[in-house]
């Protein structure tokens, strides 16, 4: 069975080329090894003066630490050095290279190829934890629609085998404190909080220990609150139409809705000479609407065949869900066979049938 | 609208490199990893490997640690796959797809790269 | 790797009818599975994920359950745009394997 990742591992005083920039380069080095990061200039031209930097803050020479313009050497390593170095132009700030370091407190021996997110004791790596995909730790706020599932990982490894546990904006966090529960997984060095809500907002710290030492890491996640809202339509739709007697129309609704939404195509009539009753409710007449076997896409489209004249008027697509109600209304034009088409006003078609 | 748009099909020789692209757009590019995704004729989908934008960092499917080399370009929010050394056995689509941030499945794909190795 | 064993390779199914897929894992995926729809010269489009979770936009006709090993997808009130390959995705680790596809045709 293949392994499935793959961590370049170092070994005494090796000089590791630069990566392209962009790239991040992880290396694995043995306590005690001498760590040697090399960055040619890109290119090959000038490179004009570098500053190398350690997480973040520039390294200062010493008898320990070496600093080139192109090369970086750190002696005697240990636990400590371990961390994300790169190499910047001073002026710009620009990362010209970038590596992610491991010490291990063994000397390094071999390929360190993790396959997934499980820790094994190898007997080689003993000492403290560290991250085995550090390429995934440094997205620090989530933010997630409420009732989605949400899972936060810290694969690590050490020697002895490290233990997880988490805490919520710094207390110890436990199944019991949320509703729905929690699903811990030591193995996958995952949280799991299925349906969250509002509540689960806040700060969640993995903390990554062994006897040799302990790390951790913090994600803040914010989740989402959908606005529940009524049904939008889509803007232009239903269209003014101009069409010929006895020709066919279409007349099309595009309804956007969380909610499962009800859509009715109706047309506006008149009664008694009047197009509105006593409290200016329009009159109209239901011409379409959900049945047993009627699909949503159905809906979304009135098909008038051989209009006459009598089908001329306003029609309106009416969209409705939990929260409300949205309407468009279009109007339809019949002109007699004989005569010529006229264009419709700007938003409108023409059909000849 | 979250778009990834990956460049044309190619056709290359046996032996030779390709490099395709996968331009994104709609979102914080270096907010999400890359995955890049195999389809063979007839075959599974297979990945092979993920980037991520921000750090530069990958993990590659050991199936394809030879073969593929990820990289991005955070200016332009584009993502790369090289390929090398190919042979008939290279010839698929390949997918990019971003990763969703908060559990891992793969939220939006482009629509492929058709690669044909031939001599 | 996790093995995802997708059934069946293809069907056939009548406008209107329901199909359901199935894909197991060779192993506890946690209900870290995800289904997809695949139509040619197009990108796969996401439509469920953590086994049942729909999509934002993907009707409620496309459905999903399962646990363990097990899951299934089902698509009820078959329209005729349904015509496309499905495929399961499993993300329970960081190794992610896909089941081998199911093409649906309409009768």
């Known amino acids: 069975e293949s392994l499935g990742t793959e961590q370049r591992v170092v070994g005494r005083a090796a000089e590791v080329p630069g990566p392209e920039p962009g790239q991040q380069e992880q290396l694995v080095f043995g306590s005690g090894d001498a760590v040697e990061l090399s960055c040619p200039p890109p290119g090959g031209g000038p490179m004009g003066p570098t500053v190398w930097v350690k997480d973040g803050t520039g390294l200062v020479p010493s008898e320990r630490v070496l600093v080139g313009p192109q090369r970086l050497q750190v002696l005697n390593a240990s636990h400590e050095d371990s961390g994300a170095y790169s190499c910047r132009q001073r002026l710009t700030q620009r990362v010209l290279c970038h590596f992610s370091v491991r010490v291990t407190d063994a000397p390094s021996s071999g390929d360190d190829e993790d396959g997934e997110d499980e820790a094994e004791d190898t007997g080689v790596d003993t000492g403290a934890p560290y991250w085995t995909r550090p390429e995934r730790m440094d997205k620090k706020l989530l933010a997630v629609p409420a009732a989605n599932t949400v899972r936060f990982r810290c694969p690590a490894a050490g020697n002895p085998t490290p233990s997880i546990s988490w805490l919520k904006n710094g207390r110890e966090f436990r199944g019991e404190h949320r509703i729905g529960g929690i699903k811990l997984r030591h193995q996958q060095w995952s949280l799991v909080m299925e349906s969250v809500v509002p509540s689960d907002r806040g700060n969640y710290t993995c903390v990554v220990e062994n006897k040799f030492g302990s790390i951790r890491q913090t994600y803040t996640l914010d989740v989402l609150e959908r606005s529940p809202h009524r049904p939008i339509l889509q803007a232009g739709l239903p269209a003014n139409q101009t069409a010929v007697l006895g020709s066919d129309v279409e007349f099309h609704c595009k309804v956007y809705s969380d909610a499962q939404p009800h859509i009715q195509w109706l047309k506006h009539v008149e009664v008694n000479g009047s197009k509105v009753g006593p409290d200016g409710t329009p009159y109209v007449t239901v011409l379409k609407t959900a049945g047993a076997n009627t699909t949503d896409k159905e809906l979304e489209v009135l098909s008038l065949h051989n209009v006459t004249f009598e089908d001329a008027g306003e029609y309106t697509c009416l969209a409705g869900n939990s929260i409300g109600f949205s309407h468009h209304s279009a109007w339809l034009v019949v002109l007699p066979a004989e005569e010529e088409l006229v264009e419709a006003d700007e938003a409108g078609s023409v059909y000849a049938g | 609208e979250v778009q990834l748009q990956q460049s044309g099909p190619e056709l290359v020789k046996p032996g030779a490199s390709v490099k395709m692209s996968c331009k994104a757009s709609?979102?914080?590019?270096?907010?999400?990893?890359m995955h890049w995704v195999k389809q063979s004729h007839g075959k599974s989908l297979q990945w092979i490997g993920y980037i991520n934008p921000n750090n530069g960092g990958t993990n590659y499917n050991q199936n394809f640690k030879d073969k593929a080399t990820l990289t991005v370009n955070k200016s332009s929010t584009t993502a790369y796959m090289e390929l090398r050394s190919l042979t008939s056995e290279d010839s698929a689509v390949y997918y990019c797809?971003?990763?969703?941030?908060?559990?891992?499945?793969?939220?939006?794909w482009g629509q492929g790269t058709s690669v044909t190795v031939s001599s | 790797d996790i093995q995802m064993t997708q059934s069946p390779s293809s069907l056939s199914a009548s406008l209107g009818g329901k199909v359901t897929i199935t894909c197991k894992a060779s192993?506890?995926?946690?209900?870290?599975i995800a289904w997809y729809q695949h139509k040619p010269g197009k990108g796969p489009r996401l439509l469920i994920h953590y086994t049942s979770t729909l999509q934002p936009g993907i009707p409620s006709r496309f459905s999903g359950s399962g646990s363990g090993r097990d899951y299934s997808f089902s698509i009820s009130n078959l329209e005729p745009e349904d015509i496309a390959t499905y495929f399961c995705l499993q993300y329970d680790n960081l190794l992610w394997t896909f089941g081998g596809g199911t093409k649906l045709e309409i009768k």
């Open positions: 709609g979102y914080t590019f270096t907010d999400y990893n």
């Open positions: 797809a971003r990763e969703r941030d908060y559990d891992g499945s793969m939220d939006f």
């Open positions: 192993q506890d995926i946690n209900k870290f």
